[in-house]
């Protein structure tokens, strides 16, 4: 059997030794102590008696079937707990009732039905994150459960197999910050929705498929909730359950952000709110993410006008990887407030990106992300953007565009644009010279000689220059990032001749190792300030005497340099 | 430059199955949608279904739902396209294609030649 | 499934002739101002090439006497002046609606 290995600070790691009990020999002196993926089945009371002062306890993944009742009892420090992913049928509130510093529990993946007879958490005054049920097994939630919580950061409760909820069991802990909830079916969605309006921030429903959800209206008074952020995460949801789940909306007023991650749409796009929900709903809502959507029938996905105005008010709108081809053209005249878009992962060509930034598209549009599409023509994407009059940012990195032309229009307002990861060889005039981000970085570029009066911050990392631009290019420059290129010196002159120069990043390129360089950066200890990753990320690539060197530490002979 | 390879041709009895490979290289494999279509001796183009090899997700001509299975090897850039319950209506050149922009086919393989004959 | 009627099925024209190719759907293949509608060359013993998508614009790389036009339901190929090269089938497909579906191609051929 292995050993615990310790740091100085008191931090063991006993994690996959093949442990099948606490191991002995375990002192004050500990202050966190691994023991996940091991086979321990059993703790004992005695067990843990001589960490007195251990603050972390991670027992994950470990076969755990048996904990004494005062097995942790001298863990008055214990701040972190896990017992996740073990064999525990059933808990016991006298394992916690000494844990009064606890602040973090997580109890997930346990194959117990209840959280146990009584309270298990009344003496947890201080406890923020709690993680509790589990796929198969955790069936009930009732109001004994949370009684002694008033107020925590996180709550995850995974309760796919629930078959019973008992009204206001979650209402007594009056401020949950984050609530995510694993849930199979919508059944009890109701019940546990009007229990926490007037307690949860942030709102996270996993796993729940939304078919069948039918709203009906909620037993509570006029209440102001606080929930801020909703999320939705591998969820099901049909056209008409979309427009039952609007309803819920009227209950929280203060929402600013909706989210839908890998969920499924078995629908066509046909939402039919009714009017007064058109009129009410998405009040104060400024923020929509959509991330992996997948909608079996994209091909015949309607135009979303039955919710345009309920969209007239958000400002940022994200539709990540969800295999978007087109945005009709009357849409994107409706989204009026919107400044932000991420367009990310999708499958835009310019062609049809024309119709989408059509004329009156998105007239507040600031930003305006198209990583990773299947944009082609570099002059034609500039050219279609001109009706966006209030773009100054622009992402269109990862697409494999044609090599660049010599001159393109864009915006006149534009400022940064990210070309990074496109391929590009060259760079002409058809950049703008209103920049002042410009991100060219991961491409074929063995030369940069582009005048760009505004410039104030270069990304050129991961590309082929062998030297630095000539900084007469840039006469603003606060920001050059040039790593991993094939730089092989910089002088005083160099850097001297950016006046304004704040940050230089160009770690990881070859460096020859001559004396004037060596002298330089042996002279001039200011260069600590201004170059990043100094001095670790700069070596010598040659003379074959210094090679792996760092720039810093490199000697260069004295017959070498005073030839 | 944008290329997709597919495999030789191919000799197969009635009632037996076919897998054909695509090889892409010259762009990101996983940004976009392979498709594959056939072609009857001296016929038209018929087609067969696609694969989005980010994630997987796949759509079929109904014709060949109960016949056709779409995969991808994202560490091979590769496409396959087995078809099952082989008869001599199968006989054809298959095609495989990169999908643009959702709704356009601008790179195809060679083809593959797929004779079945007892 | 929209089912694709090209027309004539075959074109017979001199060198340096306009050649007209026509292709109408049984449906609108219209996606909200946008038509699904693309065109294919392809030449004996190859692959079929893009000439055209979105019905009117024409692939990178593709020469500039072909284009393409129509909405709804009729899509029309043009050549400004056919050339020897354009000898082949010439094939319209959709993708408003699956399956996708060509049409039954027209053969161009020089006189």
């Known amino acids: 059997q292995e050993s615990l290995s310790c740091d100085a600070s008191g931090v063991c790691d006993g994690r996959s030794r093949s442990f099948t009990s606490i191991p002995s020999g375990l002192t004050a002196a500990m202050k966190s102590l691994d023991l996940s993926f091991n086979k321990i089945t059993y703790i004992g009371h005695g067990d843990l008696r001589a960490c007195a002062n251990l603050q972390v306890l991670m027992l994950k993944s470990s076969r755990i079937n048996t904990i004494e009742g005062d097995a942790f009892y001298s863990l008055g420090s214990l701040e972190h707990l896990d017992l996740s992913d073990n064999h525990l049928s059933s808990l016991s509130s006298s394992w916690f009732g000494p844990l009064s510093s606890l602040k973090y529990l997580n109890l997930m993946g346990n194959p117990y039905q209840t959280l146990g007879v009584t309270s298990l958490f009344p003496n947890l005054t201080n406890l923020q994150t709690l993680r509790i049920g589990n796929v198969e097994t955790f069936s009930e939630i009732r109001r004994i459960d949370f009684a002694g919580l008033t107020s925590l950061n996180e709550l995850e409760i995974k309760a796919l197999s629930l078959r019973n909820y008992q009204s206001q069991s979650l209402k007594s802990i009056r401020d949950i910050h984050h609530l995510t909830l694993h849930l199979s079916e919508s059944a009890f969605l109701l019940e546990i929705f009007a229990d926490i309006l007037s307690s949860v921030r942030y709102l996270e429903l996993r796993d729940t498929n939304l078919a069948r959800f039918q709203f009906s209206p909620l037993p509570v008074d006029e209440v102001s909730s606080p929930m801020k952020k909703l999320a939705f995460r591998g969820s099901v949801l049909t056209d008409e359950s979309f427009n039952e789940l609007l309803k819920l909306l009227r209950y929280i007023l203060e929402l600013s952000e909706v989210e839908f991650d890998d969920c499924t749409l078995n629908g066509l796009g046909d939402f039919n709110p009714s009017e007064s929900d058109v009129v009410s709903e998405l009040g104060k809502v400024e923020t929509v993410t959509i991330r992996r959507l997948h909608i079996p029938q994209f091909y015949l996905f309607y135009d979303l006008s039955t919710v345009y105005s309920l969209l007239e008010k958000v400002k940022r709108i994200t539709v990540e990887n969800s295999k978007v081809f087109l945005v009709p053209c009357s849409f994107s005249q409706h989204l009026k407030s919107l400044e932000f878009l991420d367009l990310s992962e999708n499958l835009m060509v310019e062609e049809y990106l024309k119709n989408s930034a059509c004329k009156g598209a998105w007239p507040s549009l600031q930003t305006l992300v198209l990583s990773q599409n299947h944009l082609r023509s570099m002059q034609k994407t500039g050219e279609i953007l001109l009706t966006l009059k209030n773009l100054t940012s622009l992402d269109i990195s990862r697409n494999t565009f044609h090599p660049m032309p010599d001159s393109c229009q864009w915006p006149e307002k534009m400022r940064f644009l990210n070309l990074s990861s496109t391929g590009i060889r060259v760079v002409k005039t058809c950049i703008p010279q209103t920049l002042e981000v410009l991100d060219v970085s991961n491409n074929n570029l063995d030369s940069f000689s582009l005048f760009l009066p505004r410039l104030q911050e270069l990304y050129i990392s991961r590309n082929k220059l062998k030297t630095l631009p000539d900084a007469s290019l840039f006469p603003v420059l606060l920001v050059m990032k040039i790593r991993e290129n094939a730089v092989s010196t910089f002088s005083k002159d160099q850097l001297g001749s950016f006046p304004k120069l704040e940050t230089l990043e160009a770690g990881d390129n070859h460096f020859v190792c001559s004396c004037e360089l060596l002298s330089f950066t042996m002279e001039t200890p200011a260069l600590a300030q201004i170059l990043v990753d100094w001095p670790d990320s700069y070596l010598c690539d040659s003379p074959p005497r210094l090679h792996g060197h760092r720039l810093q530490d490199a000697r260069p002979s004295v017959l070498e340099c005073h030839q | 430059q944008v290329q997709l390879v597919q495999s030789g041709s191919e000799l197969k009895k009635p009632g037996a199955s076919v897998k054909l490979s695509c090889k892409a290289s010259g762009f990101t494999f996983t940004t976009y949608g392979i498709n594959w279509v056939r072609q009857a001796p001296g016929q038209g183009l018929e087609w067969i279904g696609w694969i989005y090899p980010r994630d997987g997700s796949t759509n079929f001509n109904e014709n060949f739902k109960d016949r056709a299975t779409i995969t991808v090897d994202t560490s091979a850039s590769t496409a396959y396209m087995e078809l099952s319950s082989l008869r001599s209506e199968d006989t054809a050149v298959y095609f495989c294609?990169?999908?643009?922009?959702?709704?356009?086919?601008?790179?195809w393989g060679q083809g593959t030649t797929v004779t079945v004959s007892s | 499934d929209i089912v694709l009627t090209q027309s004539p099925a075959t074109l017979s024209l001199s060198p340096g002739e306009r050649a007209t190719l026509s292709c109408r759907a049984s449906?609108?293949?219209?996606?909200?101002?946008?038509?699904?509608m693309q065109w294919y060359q392809q030449k004996p013993g190859q692959p079929p090439k893009l000439l055209i998508f979105g019905a009117s614009n024409v692939e990178s790389g593709v020469p500039d006497r072909f284009s393409g036009s129509g909405s709804g339901t009729d899509f029309t190929l043009k050549i400004s002046r056919v050339e020897a090269e354009d000898v082949g089938m010439y094939f319209c497909q959709q993708s408003r609606k699956l399956p996708w579906t060509f049409g039954g191609g027209t053969k161009v051929e020089i006189k």
């Open positions: 449906e609108s293949v219209e996606y909200y101002g946008t038509s699904l």
């Open positions: 294609a990169r999908l643009t922009g959702g709704t356009f086919l601008d790179y």
